[in-house]
Structure formats: structure tokens, C-alpha cells
Amino acid sequence: ELCDDDPPEIPHATFKAMAYKEGTMLNCECKRGFRRIKSGSLYMLCTGNSSHSSWDNQCQCTSSATRNTTKQVTPQPEEQKERKTTEMQSPMQPVDQASLPGHCREPPPWENEATERIYHFVVGQMVYYQCVQGYRALHRGPAESVCKMTHGKTRWTQPQLICTGEMETSQFPGEEKPQASPEGRPESETSCLVTTTDFQIQTEMAATMETSIFTTEYQ
């Protein structure tokens, strides 16, 4: 089941998927001056069995200067409601991504691929958020969003990350960050993908080093 909407945006933050659930589609988009080859796939599809998942179909682009110079049309099949836009960066994979059952890793780039990727996410997909450079996390609650099905409709959960550019915050002397939450998180908010704790460690490292752990920037 495709998710009806985009994952929520958070001010001064970007999100990315660490891995893509089976059923996820990625549009075959070509950069300006290129187009999908005739009889080429409209999209790549994450498919698999219990032991292995991979992307079906290959995206291929050819120069639109050769022969007919028809304008490139973005494939938008009727049933594909979901549009995810990403900027391509170097494909550096998070370590735990490959071992997730029922998930595909980030597909490698194809020749003359467009600078933005459009994903069509499915129910159960999780995306992770991080403050952009120049901003820091004032509050680092669950920094993820999950596409869920409730009452026959899909809905993304609201991430609780607050990014601020203000340096003048009141840190109370002698106060330490809690090691763990005093209460267990409700079941609906847990996930077997990447634990919040793992991601918090990653984002804290990233914040310290002022480098992004994300390989793909979502807009």
C-alpha cells in the first residue's frame, strides 16, 4: 500500500530513508538533455523474498539530442500518488542498512540520472531526520517518521525534532542528559528498523563532527 502523503517536513532539517521497504518505487528520471530509453522502465521496484531484497528493473537514459528531441516527461502513473524528492550525493551506506530483511539499500546511480530522486514509499517505511548545517537540535525526541495505516488511511507520524539556529539557550549547570527514558515507549512508536538510540548516537556524532550522516538530501 502506497503512502498518500510526503513524510512531514521539519524546519531546518532533512530526512532520509536508511533502507527502502519492499514495494517502494523509484522513478526513472534523466537529467536535462537526456530521456528514458524507448521501452525502458518507468520505475525501479524494491522486491524480494524472505532472504533477499533487490531493485527490479534498471533505469536507463539516452541523449534526447539523438533523433526526436521530445520534451522529457516525468513518469506519473495514476496509482503513484507519492512523490519523494532527493538530491543525489555519494552513495555512502549506513552500516546496518544492508542487513534489514525485506528492505532494499539505496540503488546505485545510473548514467545521466536526474539530480533529484522521486520515491514512492509504502506503509511501514521509516525515514530519519537531522538538523541541517548551521542548526542544532534543541530537542532530540524521536527523530523519525513512520508511514502507518489507520482507519483505512495512511499517515506519517510526527517527528519530535526541533532544530534551532539560536545559540543563546539556557543550559542548566550540572544537568545531564538522561541515559534512558524512565518509561518504555508505547509499542506504536517502536520500530525494528534502526532504534532511536542508535540514530541519536549517529546524529549526536554528526552534530559534533558537523558532518552529515545522510547520503541523500530530501527536500
Epitope: E9, L138, R140, G141, P142, I162, E175, P182, E183, R185
Partner: antibody
Framework: QVQLVQSGAEVKKPGASVKVSCKAS????????MHWVRQAPGQGLEWMGV????????IYAQKFQGRVTMTRDTSTSTVYMELSSLRSEDTAVYYC????????WGQGTTVTVSS | DIQMTQSPSSLSASVGDRVTITCRAS??????LEWYQQKPGKAPKLLVY???TLAEGVPSRFSGSGSGTDFTLTISSLQPEDFGTYYC?????????FGQGTKLEIK
Amino acid sequence: QVQLVQSGAEVKKPGASVKVSCKASGYTFTDYAMHWVRQAPGQGLEWMGVISTYSGDAIYAQKFQGRVTMTRDTSTSTVYMELSSLRSEDTAVYYCARGVTFDYWGQGTTVTVSS
Amino acid sequence: DIQMTQSPSSLSASVGDRVTITCRASQDISNYLEWYQQKPGKAPKLLVYNAKTLAEGVPSRFSGSGSGTDFTLTISSLQPEDFGTYYCQHHYDTPYTFGQGTKLEIK
């Protein structure tokens, strides 16, 4: 279910301080930041500031800078808002509200400043 | 600071009417906007977040739309319990300012 329960009404003299509490239950306290919003009689809503229940960091609206202090106690899942140097214009209902989208609110605490 | 301006400041409508309240931000706030309903003597209640997502338990007659600087809250068919004051608020950056409110009365 999620509940935010605030402390009772307060009557204060000008120049004094007031400390309002907001006790959270029904969810993991440190997952959600807490905001404070006030409403003077017959007026609209005014955002005062936000505290991270996770780190204790807070950001205050410029108007209240130097007069407001927001703290939290993770052991009791309680957030506090202290406003000092009270004046009559601070007479209002003070609310705590949860998270990025203010999805749950406390019932409000009436603070009256009068000589 | 970002200013939020609501219109109208008050309105009176009949049960079954379609009601529209607008909110304008002084700068682009993307879709970082919430709508709240407040009844006299009560705390505000979240209706819509991120400009168009209906909060849990809110009747489907309420809907939100808009992006950038112009936003709308629509009640498709007004019910007697919909009276109260409606506020918009942004969460783009601190301070998170509110609109001045729209008082909705039932005719």
C-alpha cells in the same frame, strides 16, 4: 492516555515571582519538548518559550528573556515555568503544551498579579 | 519575528454553512502551520497540523490548506459545537507566534 496536569491558581503581588508546574503522564516524557503559552483575560494566545525535556535546554521569547526560567524534572515527568518581577500585565492563564505541534495542552493555571 | 494575521476577526454563521477562516504569514513558512479551536474557559485544542493534516479525533468536516504565506481552515458543514475562537500558529522558527484569533458564533 496523555495528560498534562498543571498546578493551581496563584495570586501574587507586583515584583514577586510565580512558579507553575505541568506534570505529564501517559507517554514517554523525554520524547516531547514542552512549550509554555499564556493568555491574558479576553486576549489571544502568546508563546513564551520551549524547553527540551531531553536536554533541559530552553529558548524563550524575547519579551520574557531575563524574567522567565523553564526547568524540568525527569524523575517526576514535570516541567516548571518560573516568571519573576511580576507586574499586573502578567495576569493571565498560563498553559503548557506538548511537542512540535502542541497536540496536548494542560488545563491552564490562572495567575493574578494584584497589589 | 513572523507576524500571523487572521481574517475575519469574527463571524457569525448558521448550522450547515461552509465556513472559511484565513491566516497570512508575514514571510514564507512553508507548511509549518497549525490551527487550534478554543472554547471559553478551556485550553486550546489542536485541529490541523502541518497546514493540512487533521489531528486525531477531529471530525472530517474540518480541513486545512495552503503553503508559503496563505493558509485556510475550512469547516464544510458547520455544527452547533463548532462555536469558539480559532487560532493559527506557525512553528517555522522561534518565537512561534499565533494569529490574533477568529471568533466564530453560531447564528
